[in-house]
Interface confidence: low
């Protein structure tokens, strides 16, 4: 006689909450005589899911007519799936016996797992700003999805990035999974207006991926370029010193004027002009009266940008020999 095989073709069944699940089971022989029962789990604590002979199973229906003489299909359908239904389901053949039927053979089991969408990806940037040509890391996290296979891509201004590392946890079997990916981005001076996007594709999303974004403006510091010029005023003994601070980001900037090492004015950047790339320019003026100067004046402008070390730019105002003479005369 042909040896009985219990065939459960699906190793894994993915079902969303509220859906129906069909658990397939066919047998290859009608012998030995006896019923086929469905259980969830194994061992003494297993739960009876369906018994064709007795019991009340309101959410379970059979796929085919079990009363037919030559029926070999013992598949069942469970309606209104809830998270409590997750587990491994076994169809089990019993041999007719006395006083009780005896378990004869079990199918390999079908794991029913919930299908769940990933959460909206959350992208976080580095803890501290970095300057252009440095590399910063962005992290993307999404959780709560099942099954485990998921595709994650990174984009910068719509262009796909390749330098990233992705991990899906846990490695073993689980009800749901989480993904964490870290992308490395090399900053460019024009990245103030740039954006990185993390895109997550999953079987539950039906081809409509979820996206999370972060602005590089939160991660970049563009240090200023400094330019100092002097213009004599028509008044004669006055010089206008112009200090131009260009292409910096963020706005947080403090400027201190020093005359021969002594602080003469401190100001915080307020009226800024914004460049197309998102960086800022700022101009500061200092009017210096040279009429009462006996020696050359060293004017230093000290710029402190976004909490970084101050950058100095100095200019020597040369006092003419005639002025020096007048000055010395006045002191005698």
């Amino acid at each position: 006689e042909e040896e009985l095989q219990m065939i459960q073709p699906e190793k894994l069944l993915l079902v969303a909450v509220g859906e129906s699940a069909t658990l397939n089971c066919t047998v290859t022989s009608l012998l030995p005589v006896g019923p086929v029962l469905w259980f969830r789990g194994v061992g003494p604590g297993r739960e009876l899911i369906y018994n064709q002979k007795e019991g009340h199973f309101p959410r379970v229906t059979t796929v085919s007519d079990l009363t037919k003489r030559n029926n070999m299909d013992f598949s069942i359908r469970i309606s209104s799936i809830t998270p409590a239904d997750a587990g491994t389901y076994y169809c089990v053949k019993f041999r007719k016996g006395s006083p009780e039927n005896v378990e004869f053979k079990s199918g390999p089991g079908t794991e029913m797992a919930l299908r769940a969408k990933p959460s909206a990806p959350v992208v976080s940037g580095p803890a501290a700003r970095a300057t252009p040509e440095h590399t910063v890391s962005f992290t993307c996290k999404s959780h709560g999805f099942s099954p485990r296979d998921i595709t994650l891509k990174w984009f910068k201004n719509g262009n796909e990035l390749s330098d990233f590392q992705t991990n899906v946890d846990p490695a073993g079997q689980s009800v749901s999974y989480s993904i964490r990916s870290t992308a490395r981005v090399v900053l460019a001076p024009w990245d103030v207006r740039s954006q990185v996007t993390c895109e997550v594709a999953h079987v539950t999303l039906q081809g409509d991926p979820l996206r999370g974004t972060a602005n590089l403006s939160e991660a970049i510091r563009v240090p200023p370029t400094l330019e100092v010029t002097q213009q004599p005023m028509r008044a004669g003994n006055q010089v206008n010193i112009t200090y131009q601070v260009r292409n910096f980001y963020p706005q947080n900037l403090q400027l201190t004027w020093l005359e021969n090492g002594n602080v003469c004015r401190t100001e915080t950047a307020s009226t800024l002009t914004e460049n197309k790339d998102g960086t800022y320019n700022w101009t500061s003026w200092l009017l210096v009266n040279t009429s009462d100067q006996r020696d050359d004046v060293v004017l230093t402008c000290q710029v402190k940008h976004d909490g970084q070390l101050a950058v100095n730019k100095s200019l020597v105002l040369e006092v003419s020999a005639h002025q020096k003479d007048q000055s010395s005369d006045a002191t005698h």
Epitope: L12, D149, I150, T166
Partner: antibody, heavy 126, light 113 residues
Framework: QVQLVQSGAEVKKPGASVKVSCKAS????????INWVRQAPGQGLEWMGW????????GYAQKFQGRVTMTRDTSTSTVYMELSSLRSEDTAVYYC???????????????????WGQGTLVTVSS | DIVMTQSPDSLAVSLGERATINCRSS????????????LAWYQQKPGQPPKLLIY???TRESGVPDRFSGSGSGTDFTLTISSLQAEDVAVYYC?????????FGQGTKLEIK
């Protein structure tokens, strides 16, 4: 019957790179993770990493981070493992192995390895 | 990483006798939500790739003779060959696949006495 067929033996100089291929036949190529495991002469087995041919996702052992790259060509059902900056201690037989993925349908589950390639001997010598 | 330690390193058993190989993991490989041990056993013959014998600590792979059996849970596992045959001479490895990276034992060489 699933078969994993690997490329032939290679001899490389220290500092060079080697790229080993693993061609799958007789099964659904994209439904299972392909892992790479190496075995130095007379030594045990050491896992290097995995790739899901469907999504292109990879996971590498910390030891090989930065030196190993796994890629795939879905048109030929082939997965590749490239190891760079070779040193003499990289001399080993390199195996590709398919995940058993008992409870996973084309997902990246870590699992036992049910099908193995025949192995590719990579010798690193100056 | 989980460290897998096998004992003994080598073993000589007479034909028809029972062979027992032990494997211990540095942490539990039992996953509580499905009550499964993420442990496999492999057989490797000279010049061949490893062959999967047992997974989930005790489930025999299709086509593996029933003289091979696996037992144990948590951190301590055993591979038993009930009646050694000449073709069973090989190196046997245990492997955990509970967490990344999957790790193997150092191997146990089984010979005929």
């Amino acid at each position: 019957q699933v078969q994993l067929v690997q490329s032939g033996a290679e001899v490389k100089k220290p500092g060079a790179s080697v790229k080993v291929s693993c061609k799958a036949s007789g099964g659904t190529f994209s439904s299972y993770d392909i892992n790479w495991v190496r075995q130095a002469p007379g030594q045990g087995l050491e896992w290097m990493g995995w790739m899901n041919p469907n999504s292109g996702n990879t996971g590498y052992a910390q030891k090989f981070q930065g030196r190993v790259t796994m890629t795939r060509d879905t048109s030929t059902s082939t997965v590749y493992m490239e190891l760079s900056s070779l040193r003499s201690e990289d001399t080993a037989v390199y195996y590709c192995a398919r995940d058993l993925t008992l409870y996973c349908s084309s997902t990246s589950c870590l699992d036992a390895f049910d099908y193995w390639g025949q192995g590719t001997l990579v010798t690193v010598s100056s | 990483d989980i460290v897998m330690t096998q004992s003994p390193d080598s073993l000589a058993v007479s034909l028809g006798e029972r062979a027992t190989i032990n494997c211990r993991s540095s942490q539990s490989v039992l996953y509580s939500s499905n009550n499964k041990n993420y442990l496999a056993w492999y057989q490797q013959k000279p010049g061949q790739p490893p062959k999967l014998l047992i997974y989930w600590a005790s489930t025999r792979e299709s086509g593996v003779p029933d003289r091979f059996s696996g037992s144990g849970s948590g951190t301590d596992f055993t591979l038993t060959i009930s009646s050694l045959q000449a073709e069973d001479v090989a190196v046997y490895y245990c492997q955990q696949y509970y967490s990344t990276p999957p790790t193997f034992g150092q191997g146990t060489k089984l010979e005929i006495k």
